[in-house]
């Protein structure tokens, strides 16, 4: 190896200057008594190298690139060798930004997987390898005093979410949770969340069903639908409120919302609808009056309202 490049910093802020030095050892100067060292960034030759012979006979060229505007590039020093460039050494330069503060950190407690799933927005592209770590600790109070640390949660590459398993959680106790972002140019931390996992529980929705007509029950009136729902069993003991939404299957009507309904209503007669019309219905629930997150909307149930009763003047007796 005849040459060696050293740089002021291989990773810099995008747009910052960078200084590099290329030294050619004395035993290589047979190539040319006064070799002219050339610089190249990517495919482009870079003027402005200052060259000198050092006391030990080595040749040194120093160049300052005033603005590194490439997020990744190879800087090489070379000599003219006949009609071609002889590369002596090259280094990879990276430029980017320190990580922005991760924002919009939020968490959901999933009772099915028994884990607390937290997600965040990482902020603008840094152009550098940036690692994210979900950090947390247990706290008996309002997270001002830190209890036991919980094992760091490291998301898979490129993901902005991480799951803390049940064995690291304490239900009905607060946890301090934040995201730390780190790359070669710096570290940033999101604001800390302080939460009890049960206060961010996201339930599964009930399953909507058609109400089985019972012999003694009156059939639904025109423009009415009778429906029932089966609560999600694992959330059965959690007090909830629910809401229905419905819209005609045909046409461009938007959803109409009905609620709040107590989970325990279990059955409901929905009226004020168009007669002889097919409707799509969905239900969702939330832990209430304690804090929680709305469930997703349930799978749709499709029901048709009965036709308007005939207006003939026959003497029908309705029992």
């Amino acid at each position: 190896e005849c040459g060696h490049i050293s740089v002021s910093a291989p990773i810099v802020h995008l747009g910052d200057p960078i200084t590099a030095s290329c030294i050619i050892k004395q035993n290589c100067s047979h190539l040319d008594p006064e070799p002219q060292i050339l610089w190249r960034l990517g495919a482009e030759l870079q003027p402005g190298g200052r060259q000198q012979r050092l006391s030990d006979g080595t040749q040194e060229s120093i160049i300052t690139l005033p603005h590194l505007n490439h997020t990744q590039a190879f800087l090489s020093c070379a000599l003219n060798w006949g009609n071609s460039l002889q590369i002596l050494d090259q280094v990879e330069l990276r430029a980017g930004y320190p990580p922005a503060i991760p924002h919009n950190l939020s968490c959901l407690m999933n009772l099915t997987t028994s884990s607390l799933i937290c997600q965040w927005e990482p902020g603008p592209e840094t152009h550098l390898p940036t690692s994210f770590t979900l950090k947390s600790f247990k706290s008996r109070g309002n997270c001002q005093t830190q209890g036991d640390s919980i094992l760091d949660c490291v998301p898979k590459d490129g993901q902005s979410h991480c799951s803390i398993p049940r064995k690291h959680l304490l239900l009905y106790q607060n946890m301090g949770i934040w995201v730390q972002a780190e790359n070669a140019l710096g570290t940033s931390m999101s604001p800390q969340l302080c939460l009890d996992p049960m206060d961010v529980v996201k339930l599964e929705p009930p399953m909507l069903r058609t109400m089985d007509p019972s012999p003694e029950a009156a059939p639904p009136q025109a423009g009415c639908l009778q429906l029932s729902w089966e609560p999600w069993q694992p959330g059965l003991h959690i007090n909830q409120k629910c809401e229905l939404r419905h819209k005609p299957q045909r046409g461009e009507a938007s959803w109409a919302l009905v609620g709040p309904l107590p989970l325990e209503a279990l059955q409901y007669e929905l009226c004020g609808l168009l007669p002889a019309t097919a409707y799509t219905l969905q239900i969702r629930c939330i832990r209430w009056p304690l804090p929680g997150h709305w469930s997703d909307w349930s799978p749709s149930l499709e029901l048709r309202t009965t036709e308007r009763a005939p207006t003939h003047h026959h003497h029908h007796h309705h029992h």
């Epitope: 049940r166 694992p234 059965l236 007090n239 209503a265 009056p289």
Partner: antibody, heavy 118, light 107 residues
Framework: EVQLLESGGGLVQPGGSLRLSCAAS????????MGWVRQAPGKGLEWVSS????????PYADSVKGRFTISRDNSKNTLYLQMNSLRAEDTAVYYC???????????WGQGTLVTVSS | DIQMTQSPSSLSASVGDRVTITCRAS??????LNWYQQKPGKAPKLLIY???NLQNGVPSRFSGSGSGTDFTLTISSLQPEDFATYYC?????????FGGGTKVEIK
């Protein structure tokens, strides 16, 4: 402090009826599911029935379905178990319990003994 | 119905011993598994809920683990007041079944 106090146990003949009560204090009764668990002499625990916070959902063990009725009066902070058509195998200590959100029996009364014998 | 099988049904141990009791569900119950302690003539007492959460006031020598079908209650260092019968219970769905119990006796 949560307190659950059962009453109404005693000796009853087979086929007879009994009504157990459980007076609750120290918590907001109307926000919690409640339940009854029994324990026959020298045996393990057996869940009997539970009731949702407003009384709309009332599951029962197969062994008591159709004979026992669970109910609650949130204005009186009281849980009830109406037991009809009692059998010798219903002999047990009956415990009233407060349920947590994950179905756990968080707090228990001291129990009341029901003896079904001729 | 989900059946709960506890083992052993009884065990003899000395003060200071590490004791492990297992509970198996006949089908997966996620983490909906609770452990109770009962002393003669007394009402049961909740120790662990949702498989691994220690109920308030319960000493930290008690711990729970497992998920799905296999669960464990561990007493890290048995104390004189821990000699009792222990029950597991599933609370995923009704009927809420208890295990048959494990009696921990003095060796």
């Amino acid at each position: 402090e949560v307190q659950l106090l059962e009453s109404g146990g005693g000796l009853v003949q087979p086929g007879g009826s009994l009504r157990l009560s459980c007076a609750a204090s120290g918590f907001t009764f109307s926000l919690y599911w409640m339940g009854w668990v029994r324990q026959a002499p020298g045996k393990g625990l057996e869940w009997v029935s539970s009731i949702s916070s407003s009384g709309g959902v009332t599951p029962y063990a197969d062994s008591v379905k159709g004979r026992f009725t669970i109910s609650r009066d949130n204005s009186k902070n009281t849980l009830y178990l109406q037991m009809n058509s009692l059998r010798a195998e219903d002999t047990a200590v009956y415990y009233c319990a407060k349920l947590g959100e994950l179905g756990q029996f968080m707090d228990w009364g001291q129990g009341t003994l029901v003896t079904v014998s001729s | 119905d989900i059946q709960m099988t506890q083992s052993p049904s009884s065990l003899s141990a000395s003060v200071g011993d590490r004791v492990t009791i297992t509970c198996r569900a006949s089908q997966g119950i996620s983490s909906y598994l609770n452990w109770y302690q009962q002393k003669p003539g007394k009402a049961p007492k909740l120790l662990i809920y949702y498989a691994s959460n220690l109920q308030n006031g319960v000493p930290s020598r008690f711990s729970g683990s497992g998920s799905g079908t296999d669960f464990t209650l561990t007493i890290s260092s048995l104390q004189p007041e821990d000699f009792a019968t222990y029950y597991c219970q599933q609370s995923l769905e009704y009927p809420q079944m208890f295990g048959g119990g494990t009696k921990v006796e003095i060796k």
